[in-house]
Interface confidence: medium
């Protein structure tokens, strides 16, 4: 069958019909519907929303919509024993206590079940001690403290500002430094953009606003009690002591009003430089402990949260493909929120809902996609990407054989300045071509393409006239599909101007103030940016599911592999003497990249010329494209991170949100000058070069002529 037998309309008209059916007003309506009450993972409210979405997707016309449930480890505050932090005097009396919850936003005063700010999966504990300010608690911040300033965090409670890196990495770093507790806070320098008012008068964080979030270091494991396998009815669960990624010290988040009270008394060392100073009217002294008059006062944490195995629900919708039903294109985003989820995740869920509605409308008119499209509403993303990971673990054999692509659909907006795309290089050309066909929603770009406004506002640092596309890291539901299973993945959303807004994420991220009104009043009153994101995400899914030849260009992988090889080589060349001493050579890697480039070029030529009416040859060529991403998977995984198996990309070991290229080599080289056994350390570098070179060569060979 050719793809036109799947439909009674021409392919070009299909895409136009699909895009024309997407309506901003519907996205707005869906967002409102999804944000009126909290939908915390594991709660009845989120189960009810799952059933509502299941019902609506069926109404929209999907072939089947099922709930997939798992029993996973979640974490909740104790309702009768709230978490807080105190300053205590020498008699042990609490002379200051942090806020027990955020003051509710106007109109939401009587909403029940707003979970107070907490760090999910924090152990219980009531440590008390001197405070040390550790800036962002990054690896380099602890290097500065311990190596340059000779400040010992052992037995101290550290206070770190949110931003720059994933909070779980901060906690891991604090644990490794010997801290006995961690206080996380939002500094106005990072979460209060100059010239903008705080909510409800603007989109900035008020002093009482607090960022919730998990503090796990799962490294792709999913449910901490069932790593590698689904948390189903007959699962064998680890004991809590053997659980993956749980923090070992109490952690709690606060807002900047409370942080002011803790930081204003700090004594000890002055901040090492201006990069350690935020925007509060405090000295940003590092400590340890309080200054002069307050030196006998200590900080005490009171953490009483509990970890509980709880049922979660994914919604999985299927639109069966007419020609290749055994090839899956997946569009997935999460449904669970910390509170109202005005941006995260419901701005994404509302877009997915409208995409499903549009596909359903076409299906009701007699159309079907060439390939099967799976739609997913994931649960428990906020607790460690649990819903998506458990489902992928349960369906891994199908996915690794049939998975064409995964498009992620969390928050549609984190700003309203320009498009932001992170994806596999295989999708670069798809994204470029699609955005050239879409209209820009940006002011000053009326009648211009999205590609044009995006390129102007976010130019590629390497290629002139092209937009920036970033590497995939983690911190979202594509992780298991890309990093573990090697399924080509991508994500798109509207973002802020990173040049002028240096704060981390958006100010109200994971706070109670992330409401429908935040989006409707301040970010996207016309919902035009949401519509554009729907067109990009939906358009990518449409092309991936419907184009006769998969819209992947393997030559773009060749280009980035060369760039990444150059980068890792230059990092290694900072140690020329050791490279000589230990005979470290990158020749094998550069040779493999050269081979990949030549083979990819020849494959692309064959792709232009082959007989597309021959279904066997077509399927063969498409399979080579589909399985290319899979070829970068090392079944043994990265050192100490068995579920990060992609050799070209992994989440940074220092920041889960960021992607690192050739992560095995990068980690082997990191801080190598401080290793006690240099011979062993450089031996590991050589081993990682070998693994990378072999993998690139093996991937290249999957693109060679089959016989």
């Amino acid at each position: 069958k050719s793809s036109n037998e799947a439909t009674n309309i021409t392919p070009k008209h299909n895409m136009k019909a699909f895009l024309d059916e997407l309506k901003a007003e519907n996205i707005k309506k869906f967002l409102y519907n999804f944000t009126q009450i909290p939908h915390l993972a594991g709660t009845e409210q989120n189960f009810q929303l799952a059933k509502q979405i299941q019902s609506q997707w069926k109404e929209f016309g999907l072939d089947s919509v099922e709930l997939a449930h798992y029993d996973v480890l979640l974490s909740y505050p104790n309702k009768t024993h709230p978490n807080y932090i105190s300053i205590i005097n020498e008699d042990g009396n609490e002379i200051f206590n942090t806020s027990l919850f955020e003051p509710p936003p106007p109109g939401y005063e009587n909403v029940s079940d707003i979970v107070p700010p907490f760090s999910a999966f924090s152990p219980q504990g009531m440590p008390e001690g001197d405070l040390v300010y550790v800036n962002y608690a990054r690896t380099e911040d602890f290097f500065k403290l311990e190596r340059d300033m000779k400040i010992n965090c052992s037995g101290k409670i550290v206070i770190a500002r949110y931003g720059k890196v994933f909070r779980g990495n901060k906690v891991k770093n604090a644990q490794l430094a010997g801290a006995k507790g961690v206080i996380l806070y939002s500094d106005p320098a990072d979460y209060f953009a100059p010239g903008v008012k705080s909510y409800p008068d603007g989109w900035n964080l008020p002093g009482g606003g607090v960022q919730r979030g998990n503090i796990l270091n799962l490294n792709g494991a999913g449910d901490p009690l069932t790593p590698g396998y689904p948390a189903n009815e007959y699962a064998y669960r680890r004991g809590i002591a053997e659980a993956v990624g749980l923090p070992s010290i109490p952690v709690h988040p606060i807002g900047y009003y409370d942080a002011q009270k803790l930081l204003e008394k700090m004594g000890g060392s002055a901040p090492p430089d201006s990069s350690w100073r935020g925007s509060l009217k405090v000295p940003y002294n590092v400590g340890p402990g309080f200054t002069g008059n307050f030196s006998t006062q200590k900080v005490k944490m009171h953490i009483h949260s509990t970890n509980e195995v709880t049922r979660i629900y994914n919604v999985i919708g299927t639109l069966r493909g007419a020609v290749e039903p055994d090839r899956y294109v997946i569009l997935g985003g999460h449904r669970d929120s910390w509170v109202f989820g005005g941006i995260d995740p419901q701005s994404g869920a509302a877009v997915v809902h409208e995409i499903v509605r549009s596909f359903g409308t076409l299906k009701k008119e007699g159309w079907r996609p060439r390939r099967t499209i799976l739609f997913a509403s994931w649960d428990a993303e906020e607790f460690g990407l649990l819903g998506s990971t458990e489902w992928a673990e349960e369906n891994s054999r199908l996915l690794q054989e049939r998975g064409v692509a995964y498009i992620n659909a969390d928050s549609s907006i984190e700003g309203n300045y320009t498009l932001r795309v992170d994806c596999t290089p295989l999708m670069y050309s798809l994204v470029h071509n699609l955005t050239k066909e879409l209209k820009s929603p940006d002011e000053g770009f009326e009648g211009k393409s999205l590609y044009e406004s995006w390129t102007k506002k976010s130019p590629s640092p390497e290629f002139s006239g092209m937009p920036r596309i970033s590497k995939l890291g983690s911190g979202n539901d594509f992780e298991v599909f890309f990093q573990r299973l090697g399924i080509a993945s991508g994500r798109a959303r509207y973002t802020k101007n990173w040049e002028t807004n240096k704060f981390s994420g958006y100010p109200l991220y994971h706070s109670v103030y992330e409401t429908y009104e935040l989006v409707e009043k301040f970010y996207d009153p016309m919902f035009k940016y949401h519509l554009t994101v729907a067109q990009v995400r939906g358009g990518m899914v449409f092309e991936l599911a419907n184009s006769i030849v998969l819209p992947f260009d393997c030559r773009d992988y060749a280009v980035v592999l060369r760039k990444y090889a150059d980068k890792i080589y230059s990092i290694s060349m900072k140690h020329p003497q050791e490279m000589k001493t230990y005979s470290v050579s990158f020749d094998s890697l550069f040779s493999a990249v050269k081979n990949f480039t030549e083979i990819a070029s020849k494959f692309s030529e064959r792709l232009q010329d082959f007989d597309k009416s021959n279904p066997i040859v077509l399927r063969m060529m498409n399979d080579q494209l589909m399985f290319l991403e899979r070829a970068f998977i090392d079944p043994l995984g990265l050192p100490d991170r068995p579920f990060y198996r992609h050799v070209i990309y992994a989440p940074s070991s220092h920041n889960k949100y960021a992607g690192e290229s050739f992560p095995g080599i990068y980690d082997a080289l990191f801080d190598i000058e401080s290793k006690v056994d240099p011979s062993k350390a450089w031996g590991e570098v050589k081993r990682q070069i070998y693994v990378a070179a072999f993998t690139v060569q093996a991937a290249a060979e999957t693109l060679s002529e089959v016989a």
């Epitope: 609490e94 206590n97 806020s99 027990l100 919850f101 955020e102 003051p103 509710p104 106007p106 005063e109 009587n110 008012k197 705080s198 409800p200 008068d201 008020p206 002093g207 009482g208 009003y257």
Partner: antibody, heavy 120, light 106 residues
Framework: EVQLVESGGGLVQPGGSLRLSCAAS????????MAWVRQAPGKGLEWVAN????????YYLDSLKSRFTISRDNAKNSLYLQMNSLRAEDTAVYYC?????????????WGQGTTVTVSS | QIVLTQSPDFQSVTPKEKVTIQCSAS?????MYWYQQKPDQSPKPWIY???NLASGVPSRFSGSGSGTDYTLTINSLEAEDAATYYC?????????FGQGTKLEIK
């Protein structure tokens, strides 16, 4: 020194109007919500109205909404309360107060008050 | 609107005695705030967010409570503590104060 100074109080007949002013000094006026709170003779405190940073949002005691208007002029570091159709029960000391935050509603700085007497 | 009821309305206490003032809300509130007012003076912020003492407030004062029931406690009353104390909620508009508790020194 952080200071709030009210003015504009006095004796007015029922049905009359009065405009109270509050001059702020010693802090960045535009960074704070502001409020009026009143206290009838021998009685307790009663919140009258709040205004956000730039005056775009105002909040009133329901029973006063139609007669009282809170406003501000950030350029002049001034807060105002326009009171129309005054009644005997509006007789009180009117305090201008700084609201530390739009949520916590913690009135951390108060003026000395200005007396309004409504009597024929 | 949320009604705050203080008890007692009036209390006459001897120095060094422990004093508790109750504030009951007609529906649950996030936090309670307390102010002290002396005759012919403006109110002064005294306790914010239920349990935190405003700047300059002696440590013999403390605040506690949650939901609908809140308490201001003076551990060992001193003469300078004679005043009227008001509780206030900011959970929802309209903002409301309690009717006040007048503390007199015997």
């Amino acid at each position: 020194e952080v200071q709030l100074v009210e003015s504009g109080g006095g004796l007015v007949q029922p049905g009359g109007s009065l405009r109270l002013s509050c001059a702020a000094s010693g802090f960045t006026f535009s960074d704070y919500y502001m409020a009026w709170v009143r206290q009838a003779p021998g009685k307790g405190l009663e919140w009258v109205a709040n205004i956000n940073y730039d005056g775009s949002s105002t909040y009133y005691l329901d029973s006063l909404k139609s007669r009282f208007t809170i406003s501000r002029d950030n350029a002049k570091n001034s807060l105002y309360l326009q009171m129309n159709s005054l009644r005997a029960e509006d007789t009180a000391v009117y305090y201008c107060a700084r609201d530390l935050d739009g949520y916590y509603g913690y009135f951390d700085v108060w003026g000395q008050g200005t007396t309004v007497t409504v009597s024929s | 609107q949320i009604v705050l009821t203080q008890s007692p309305d009036f209390q006459s206490v001897t120095p060094k005695e422990k004093v508790t003032i109750q504030c009951s809300a007609s529906s649950s509130v996030s936090y309670m705030y307390w102010y002290q007012q002396k005759p012919d003076q403006s109110p002064k912020p005294w306790i914010y967010r239920t349990s935190n003492l405003a700047s300059g407030v002696p440590s013999r004062f403390s605040g506690s409570g949650s939901g609908t029931d809140y308490t201001l406690t003076i551990n060992s009353l001193e003469a300078e503590d004679a005043a009227t104390y008001y509780c206030q909620q900011y959970h929802s508009y309209p903002l409301t104060f309690g009717q006040g508790t007048k503390l007199e020194i015997k």
